[in-house]
Interface confidence: low
Amino acid sequence: AIVFIKQPSSQDALQGRRALLRCEVEAPGLVHVYWLLDGAPVQDTERRFTQGSSLSFAAVDRLQDSGTFQCVARDDVTGEEARSANASFNIKWIEAGPVVLKHPASEAEIQPQTQVTLRCHIDGHPRPTYQWFRDGTPLSDGQSNNTVSSKERNLTLRPAGPEHSGLYSCCAHNAFGQACSSQNFTLSIADESFARVVLAPQDVIVARNEEAMFHCQFSAQPPPNLQWLFEDETPITNRSRPPHLRRATVFANGSLLLTQVRPRNAGVYRCIGQGQRGPPVILEATLHLAEIEDMPLFEPRVFTAGSEERVTCLPPKGLPEPSVWWEHAGVRLPTHGRVYQKGHELVLASIAESDAGVYTCHAANLAGQRRQDVNITVATVPTWLKKPQDSQLEEGKPGYLHCLTQATPKPTVVWYRNQMLISEDSRFEVFKNGTLRINNVEVYDGTWYRCVSSTPAGSIEAQARVQVLEKLKFTPPPQPQQCMEFDKEATVPCSATGREKPTIKWERADGSSLPEWVTDNAGTLHFARVTRDDAGNYTCIASNGPQGQIRAHVQLTVAVFITFKVEPERTTVYQGHTALLQCEAQGDPKPLIQWKGKDRILDPTKLGPRMHIFQNGSLVIHDVAPEDSGRYTCIAGNSCNIKHTEAPLYVVDKPVPEESEGPGSPPPYKMIQT
């Protein structure tokens, strides 16, 4: 016989949770176990399946698992079959649903003072307990003229009034859990005494001196009050108009008319409707004065043929927003083609030379029209009018190299000398037509020159060699006045250069020949022993075949160079005493003596009463002060040379004599006593 050791039993289960119906059998032979639900065999699924002899539920389903389960054991050999006791689930569940209107039949039938019933479609087992909410606030039994049964799913409002308007929702809970309405119900019960908007004013943009109209209408029973305010506070009525709204008229239907609008009328207008009950309804509309600013200037544009280019027209700031269009030769550009308008952009696709010209961006709105021109140039590659030529330029004179080209726009020309860019300075000048002028040509200007002519479309270049024709000149020119020391050896050099090496010779200016102790050796005049007679005017002559000759005149002076007979000594003087700095010089011409003290020349005419320079050159300073201390320099000079010697001057305080010292005691250092 087949015996059930464990039989399935009825049990509580939670929707969507695990469950197990147990079944265990004992039999002499092999038996196979299967399950019945309401008498029909149970097929295994991932959700519900046999586990040994028991039936396992991964997630209980209140619809598919309702009914009676039975465990059946069958011996296929003997045909014997045994059935367990019946078992079923008491499934606990809760499921959200919407809030719906139960009475009246449609929203259109909802009127003030009628009964309104709402139903909460949240279902569950065991039967849930319900809680209603208006605008998120819980409603309790008997609150604000409504009858609510929290055990029931219906909410009855009787009678329903405007104060019941709001968003109704419900929540419910049972042993399984809690759920809230999946869709809420908005109850809107109008109160005829509340002001309601019939016609709202719209923002207006008008041109100066035009008229503006704002429409505003409210309805209520009894009829509502309507008032217009300007900006934040100024009331507008036909009886009391603010000074700046003299031309405002309020019509019986609530419309506000403003004539000859001025800038001061611009702003926010508020239309306020107030019913017998309820809050004031405030509607706002803004009056904008149409305006249009000036457009920014366009820079001239240069484009190259074949390219695609765009020119953006920034519309001027304006109210309303200005419309923008492009014109060329008085014709509005199309929105497609090779030259067309796209948005605010002028588009030139595959530019041709013929596209060059003036294009105009127009902008317009209620306040007026603005326009701005842009000049478009289509660049071409330069062509030669005159290339630079190899040239011979004369030293010391201006020289010109030409680089004449033509193109659109006017080409820019730069010059290079020996690969180095020539920047304009006092010697180089590039003319507008591209010609290079070299002012005062120098020998080292002889080199390669290259000019480059460019436009955005491309450039051309050419080079030329400059040869400098050197002028016949002294290098360096001899000093026009020179001194020679009496009874000493002296030389006077003279050298020159030219296109051909010049020959150089000296002669006396009076044409007389040079004495035998004076020699002319390849341009150097040599005096073996200078005599007084050697003084005078001499001429150096340089000459070559092609360039002729040049002359330089030199006046030679014979002089005895300066020596000091007396030099100033290091001197220390008591404050308030007199200092004497001696200086005597000799030479021919007789030297003049100047003194420099404290790094400035002492001007004899501006020395003041304390200082004096004697004829023999000595410097005396009376009533010396500490600030007179310092180095003093004796400078002796004549037309031939200059010499100087210096000595320090110290000014010290006179010591107070001590007891042991008599009045005749000598000072501790060498002094000048006056």
């Epitope: 900006e231 934040d232 506070e233 009331p235 603010p242 700046h244 800038p263 611009a266 702003g267």
Partner: antibody, heavy 114, light 107 residues
Framework: QVQLQQSGAELAKPGASVRLSCKAS????????MHWLKQRPGQGLEWIGY????????EYNQNFKDKATLTADKSSSTAYMQLSSLTYEDSAVYYC???????WGTGTTVTVSS | DIVMTQSPSSLSASLGDTITITCHAS??????LSWYQQKPGNIPKLLIS???NLHTGVPSRFSGSGSGSGFTLTISSLQPEDIATYYC?????????FGSGTKLEIK
């Protein structure tokens, strides 16, 4: 929060001019008018006039037409009042106040003394 | 100009009392009347606008009523912090004008 910060006290000689400022913060300056008021010591309030910062439009009490000049700078959210040809009668506390007088400035004391 | 006549000019009352200040306009100002409180040494503060609208943050013991040319400010259950001067002001037409003030003291 909404605030109106007024400039500090002014001491001026008769015949001189002063310029008072009122800096607004915490709201859109151009959406509200700015009123100016006068209060002499121990006395009541007198309305001087207002300016609409949005348009620059002004409205004056006739009693102050030749005394006060109202201006506003939108970029700095500041309203100004210039008082000219000062006399001893102009010694007072001057307030700025937003539309509806719902927010008042801190007040500026002007003293006219020789 | 519209003249605002405020009465009384001064008033002495006990804590917890209800007091009334009146303001009369020389012509119809509809509802365009505001009330202000100014404590000694302080700036004025808006209490009520448009005759009866309590300004944000103002205690509910303050209330306003009236329309046309007669208006009233009522303070119920007087508190120590209510010691101040009270002004009415019309906003119907320019120039805006104020009452001369009512000085409230505690007995």
């Amino acid at each position: 929060q909404v605030q109106l910060q007024q400039s500090g006290a002014e001491l001026a000689k008769p015949g001189a001019s002063v310029r008072l400022s009122c800096k607004a913060s915490g709201y859109t300056f151009t959406r509200y008018w700015m009123h100016w008021l006068k209060q002499r010591p121990g006395q009541g309030l007198e309305w001087i006039g207002y300016i609409n910062p949005s348009s620059g439009y002004t409205e004056y009490n006739q009693n102050f037409k030749d005394k006060a000049t109202l201006t506003a700078d939108k970029s700095s959210s500041t309203a100004y009042m210039q008082l000219s040809s000062l006399t001893y009668e102009d010694s007072a506390v001057y307030y700025c106040a937003r539309s509806y007088f719902d927010v008042w400035g801190t007040g500026t004391t002007v003293t006219v003394s020789s | 100009d519209i003249v605002m006549t405020q009465s009384p000019s001064s008033l002495s009352a006990s804590l917890g009392d209800t007091i009334t200040i009146t303001c009369h306009a020389s012509q119809n100002i509809n509802l365009w009347l505001s009330w202000y409180q100014q404590k000694p040494g302080n700036i004025p503060k808006l209490l009520i606008s448009k005759a009866s609208n309590l300004h944000t943050g103002v205690p509910s013991r303050f209330s306003g009523s009236g329309s046309g040319s007669g208006f009233t400010l009522t303070i119920s259950s007087l508190q120590p912090e209510d010691i101040a001067t009270y002004y009415c002001q019309q906003g119907q037409s320019y120039p805006f004008t104020f009452g001369s003030g009512t000085k409230l003291e505690i007995k």
